[in-house]
């Protein structure tokens, strides 16, 4: 018997210091480029090897970025979001939403959660 898949959503504040090659990640999303149906939010699509985000270790592919240095990322065009990151300065504070996949087995059994990609 297969269990249903649920998601555990958590939020975290991540402070990154811009490295020699920048912050070290890619994003998708925006009002003109929806990554998730009916959601114009900004999502992390790639963490670059040895970049600031990878070395910090907390930001994950698939995370939703809610704000940058306190500025909300809701209802932004994709390029406007990109520009916001590029102009965010040396110390960058990200409010992110992680979504962990939790496999619920048959009644009485709860499987372990895996980060969703």
């Amino acid at each position: 018997m297969n269990g249903r898949v649920d998601y555990l959503v958590t939020e975290e504040e991540i402070n990154l210091t811009r490295g020699p090659s920048g912050l070290g990640f890619n994003i998708v999303g925006g009002t003109d480029q929806q990554y998730v149906s009916n959601d114009s939010g900004i999502y992390v699509s790639r963490i670059k090897e040895n970049g600031a985000a990878a070395l910090d270790g907390r930001l994950q592919e698939g995370d939703k970025i809610l704000s940058v240095n306190g500025q909300d990322l809701k209802n932004l065009l994709h390029q406007d979001a990109v520009d916001l990151f590029r102009n965010a300065g040396y110390a960058v504070s990200l409010r992110v939403q992680h979504r962990l996949q939790v496999q619920n087995g048959p009644i009485g059994h709860r499987g372990e959660g895996d980060p969703s990609g």
């Epitope: 090659s21 920048g22 912050l23 070290g24 990640f25 890619n26 994003i27 998708v28 990554y35 992390v44 699509s45 790639r46 963490i47 670059k48 090897e49 592919e61 698939g62 994709h78 390029q79 990109v82 990151f85 590029r86 969703s116 990609g117």
Partner: nanobody, 128 residues
Framework: DVQLVESGGGLVQAGGSLRLSCAAS????????MGWFRQRPGKERDVVAT????????YYLDSVKGRFTISRDNAKNTVFLQMNSLKPEDTAVYYC??????????????????????WGQGTQVTVS
């Protein structure tokens, strides 16, 4: 994680054609940059062709330009490598690779251009 499964390899005579396919699962395919790499006997793995997540930018190894074509079908979560006018030196294990696409938050130019972090198991292509 992203899972990649290649198919379409085999034995073909010089001058012949093969079409490799790579089916991806595990996350939205339309957000992935895709690539084909190959490892020839006794050599390192080389990039053959890449296609970005939007499908509007491709790259080809000089020696395959005009003979190989990379394409993607986002509805089928699949990337293809059409290989024509095959030569014995194309004999290799061909690997499908993926990475997250999207826009770099750092600059318009991507460092580590061929840095891919998800790999298939490979499919053998032998040209006799």
């Amino acid at each position: 994680d992203v899972q990649l499964v290649e198919s379409g390899g085999g034995l073909v005579q010089a001058g012949g054609s093969l079409r490799l396919s790579c089916a991806a699962s595990g996350r939205p395919f339309s957000s992935l940059d895709m690539g084909w790499f190959r490892q020839r006997p006794g050599k390192e793995r080389d990039v053959v062709a890449t296609i970005n997540w939007t499908g509007d930018s491709t790259y080809y190894l000089d020696s395959v330009k005009g003979r190989f074509t990379i394409s993607r079908d986002n509805a089928k979560n699949t990337v293809f490598l059409q290989m024509n006018s095959l030569k014995p030196e194309d004999t290799a294990v061909y690997y499908c690779a993926a990475r997250g696409g999207g826009s770099s938050v750092d600059s318009e130019y991507d460092v580590g251009e061929f840095e891919y972090n998800y790999w298939g198991q490979g499919t053998q292509v032998t040209v006799s």
